[in-house]
Interface confidence: medium
């Protein structure tokens, strides 16, 4: 299907590419001595980039700092120094640049202020950083300003004094709506959820916090939970971990109505040293990690039903080091239903696993064609691909980038990996899949930085090296053939690749610095590939592809979550522009239902290798500890529930007698007396 990658051979040689790229390579040298650079894109398809350079000298008592702000409006080909727009103020890099949602054009920079000042200072822009307004704050911010996803004029921030501050006019005026706030988040419809401590402090009251909600930006409040440890939002679900009455364990409760009613999630409770983590969530379901007791470094992934209440065990021994630590869990955004993560074996080796059906079944990644099994493999002919992700990066392995996929580059996944029985500490190579992870091929020897341009029409890579570099590699056929382009005669110490988020652009910026005896000078090279892909793609450049196809003889071939999708994909041999307006063309078709389209409802489970759901023996004839909507209630079930997001129709309907599961509600989490409504007078 695809051969081993070739570099600079006659394989798909592009005529005059050096001349075409030389004419479209733009250098910008930054005239300052900064130690660090941060870059942000402002808006979508605007071409606007902001670059903040900072230089800090820690002196004995205070630190001296200087910032410079640069702006490009042509995707990084040219930059203009706009430091004067922020009055040459030193910007606090830990707050970054707060870029507004969607195409609002809003930017907030948080400035450093002198010790005795009453509050902080921000610079605000609502015109894609053409102009900035200086605003002095009535508080010192603890966190970056958070924009409401629904209205970019609404902002919230926490102060160093744990006050919750809200602005309704893009930071011009601020009001403290609550004190003693530990964590605050925007929910849907401009709702703010936050936890407050009642007695001492956020840390001391962990597990005794209250969860509050305001739907009117702080005019009125409702306490929606007590004995809270923490809370989180994922998809349409609001989660809270709640302390148990009897001991120091805590349990997850879930709400789908912004906290008006709660149900106890059917997940194991966790102790003080353990944690829950929402790995991924959408409008249909959630992936939840539950940490194992003890300092094991692993836990279990559970997937939820459509209510977020009933959970199926998805993957055992899932690698997740500590709270807020490292997990390799990756959503492969280029193909629906695909996720990759790592498990920790009994022998402490780390192995990659992939699911193609949203966590229903996990398997090892198929060994790339024509690849040899490395030293980790017991059997030199049978092994699998193991992907390096966050954990490897945290362990300082020679892995410059996490796996990469883009929704509009259908089926493409690029990642560092090794071929064996487990992840290897040896120098990894770069592998590519063009079918969403079903099959893999080695793309590049050794570690590289990589990015996807023009919705997959071009892949760009730069070798990861300690030495200065001046070569960029690119492929127009999904990583099969590679051309090398020398973008500068003066090699630079490479620090990063920057391309506009969304992978629609044809521009790539190569960032780095040159170093002389005493000075370091930042430089960027922006390469525009528009003349490599000189014509627009036409109908004949695309071919149909059935996603998830593994068995063309099977009537359910390609069916994932009850439907299959045929995509129009660019032929590997076509060298043309998808273009900025490219929309992924797909034709979905509904599949007939089979038992694979159903999960087991509360009180039921699937025996190993079985299709049917059966009653859990330990629950037969018992009152079930189950709490739905915070009150005792009869739960009727036939043992099956359609998998969240599954669209199958007809076929098999697992109808059988409906059982009435009598149960007692053991959650006093929502004691009605606690559900006060308060007004902010």
């Amino acid at each position: 299907r695809r051969g081993a990658p070739a570099e600079d051979q006659d394989c798909g040689r592009l005529p005059d590419f050096i001349a075409k790229l030389t004419n479209n390579t733009h250098q910008h040298v930054f005239d300052d001595l900064s130690g660090s650079v941060s870059l942000s894109w402002v808006g979508d398809s605007t071409g606007v980039i902001l670059v903040l350079t900072t230089f800090q000298v820690p002196l004995v008592i205070v630190s001296f700092g200087q910032s410079k702000l640069y702006r490009s409006e042509d995707y990084g080909k040219n930059f203009k120094d706009i430091t004067n727009l922020i009055n040459n103020t030193f910007i606090r890099t830990e707050f970054g640049m707060a870029i507004g949602p969607e195409n609002s054009g809003k930017v907030i920079l948080t400035a450093e202020v002198s010790g005795g000042s009453r509050g902080g200072r921000v610079f605000r822009s609502s015109d894609f950083a053409k102009n900035f307004v200086q605003t002095d704050l009535p508080f010192h911010p603890l966190t970056q300003m958070m924009y409401s996803p629904q209205n970019s004029d609404y902002l919230l921030a926490l102060s160093t004094e744990n006050g919750l501050w809200v602005s309704k006019n893009f930071g011009e005026k601020w009001e403290e709506i609550h004190k003693a706030v530990c964590l605050a988040k925007w929910g849907p419809n401009n709702i703010i959820f936050f936890t407050t401590h009642v007695n001492g402090s956020c840390k001391a009251d962990l597990g005794a916090l209250e969860l509050w909600r305001t739907s009117d930006l702080g005019k009125t409040f409702k306490t929606i939970g007590v004995k809270i440890y923490s809370f989180g939002l994922g998809g349409r679900f609001l989660f809270a971990s709640v302390m148990a009455d009897k001991d120091t364990t805590r349990r997850i409760h879930v709400s789908t109505d912004q906290g008006d009613t709660w149900s106890m999630a059917q997940l194991p409770s966790v102790g003080q040293e353990q944690f829950y983590s929402i790995l991924a969530a959408n409008e249909d379901m959630v992936f939840m990690h539950v940490d194992e007791p003890g300092d094991t470094g692993f836990g279990t992934i559970f997937t939820s039903d459509d209510r977020g209440i009933v959970y199926s065990k998805s993957l055992d021994r899932h690698l997740y080091t500590t709270t807020g630590g490292e997990t390799d869990f990756t959503n492969v955004t280029s193909l629906r239903g695909v996720y990759i993560t790592s498990t920790l074996s009994e022998d402490n080796s780390i192995q990659s696993m992939i699911t193609f059906d949203q966590g229903g079944r996990w398997e090892h990644l198929r060994k790339p064609e024509n690849s040899k099994c490395d030293a980790t493999a017991k059997n030199k002919n049978e092994c699998s691909l193991h992907i390096h992700a966050s954990y490897s990066i945290s362990q300082k392995l020679n892995v410059p980038m996490a796996p990469l996929s883009e929704p509009n580059a259908v089926g493409i996944v690029i990642a560092h990996g090794s071929v064996g029985d487990a992840i290897s500490v040896m120098v990894p190579d770069v592998y590519i899949s063009d079918d969403g992870g079903y099959s893999w091929a080695k793309m590049l020897e050794g570690p590289h930085y990589y990015t996807i341009l023009d919705s997959g029409g071009i892949i760009v890579a730069i070798e990861h090296s300690n030495r200065p570099i001046n070569v960029i590699k690119f492929s127009t056929d999904e990583g099969q053939c590679w051309q090398s382009y020398v973008f500068t005669q003066e090699p630079i110490y490479f620090t990063g690749l920057a391309s506009e988020p969304g992978a629609r652009s044809m521009n790539i910026s190569i960032w780095g610095f040159t170093e002389s005896f005493i000075t370091r000078q930042w430089v960027s090279y922006t390469v525009d590939f528009k003349d490599i892909l000189e014509r627009n793609c036409e109908e004949d450049d695309y071919t149909t592809w059935l996603a998830h196809s593994t068995d063309p003889g099977d009537y359910k071939d390609g069916c994932i979550l009850g439907y299959k999708e045929q995509f129009l994909r660019l032929r590997k041999s076509s060298v043309c522009q998808n273009g900025r307006d490219y929309v992924v063309a797909k034709q979905p078709s509904v599949c007939p239902c089979s038992l694979e389209d159903f999960l087991c409802d509360f009180g039921y489970f699937r025996p190993e290798n079985a299709s049917e759901c059966v009653e859990q023996p330990e629950l037969k004839g018992h009152e079930l500890e189950f709490c739905l909507y915070g009150k005792e209630e009869h739960l009727t079930t036939n043992g099956y529930r359609k998998i969240p997001g599954d669209k199958c129709q007809g076929g098999m309907n697992p109808a059988r007698e409906v059982k009435d599961l009598k149960k007692k509600c053991t959650s006093n989490f929502l004691n009605p007396t606690k559900q006060n409504s308060k007004s902010n007078s």
């Epitope: 068995d551 063309p552 003889g553 099977d554 009537y555 359910k556 071939d557 007939p592 089979s594 038992l595 694979e596 025996p607 290798n609 079985a610 299709s611 049917e612 759901c613 059966v614 009653e615 043992g639 076929g651 098999m652 697992p654 059988r656 007698e657």
Partner: antibody, heavy 121, light 109 residues
Framework: QVQLQESGPGLVKPSETLSLTCAVS?????????WGWIRQPPGKGLEWIGS???????YYNPSLKSRVTISVDTSKNQFSLKLSSVTAADTAVYYC??????????????WGQGTLVTVSS | EIVLTQSPGTLSLSPGERATLSCRAS???????LAWYQQKPGQAPRLLIY???SRATGIPDRFSGSGSGTDFTLTISRLEPEDFAVYYC??????????FGGGTKVEIK
Amino acid sequence: QVQLQESGPGLVKPSETLSLTCAVSGYSISSGYYWGWIRQPPGKGLEWIGSIYHSGNTYYNPSLKSRVTISVDTSKNQFSLKLSSVTAADTAVYYCARGPPELGKMYFQHWGQGTLVTVSS
Amino acid sequence: EIVLTQSPGTLSLSPGERATLSCRASQSVSSSYLAWYQQKPGQAPRLLIYGASSRATGIPDRFSGSGSGTDFTLTISRLEPEDFAVYYCQQHGRLPPWTFGGGTKVEIK
């Protein structure tokens, strides 16, 4: 070793209901697996009638669905077939059989020896 | 429903010869979902092959299955006297009905 044994009347009158039971030994029905009925008219080929899982989920041949009921009795470790409104065309050797617990693997590894049922007045 | 047609209806061969039995489906069947059975007079069928090519427990390796899509084959590499019987194919996919072919009789020439 799992063994299956069909039992029931060898002669049934037309329009009446054919009732057969399959007794399972050497394996607990409630431990999983699909349990099925297959028939073979004299000198002819095999026809799948239906299958049941121990939890009670049933799957029937559409051509017989309106007349067939398969049920399971886990306490007696047996499952049963009822075929109503029989005609001479229902004369066949009736086999009970066991298949794996996975749909998509509805082949039959273990069979009873079969029982001949004749429909005649 | 998927109709399975077996050919030939009767195959006359001598012991030691190679037997090739065909099973054709009216629509595509996944190779994962085709089985073969052997039935001798007065006996229940016996499972030989499932998943088109996997031998059932205790089946000698002279029996092999192959094929995909609509065409499947059961091969008996060297016929033994006890192999003369009727052979049925069956599709066992994820949705009912699960159907059998009409059978091929392998008789002694």
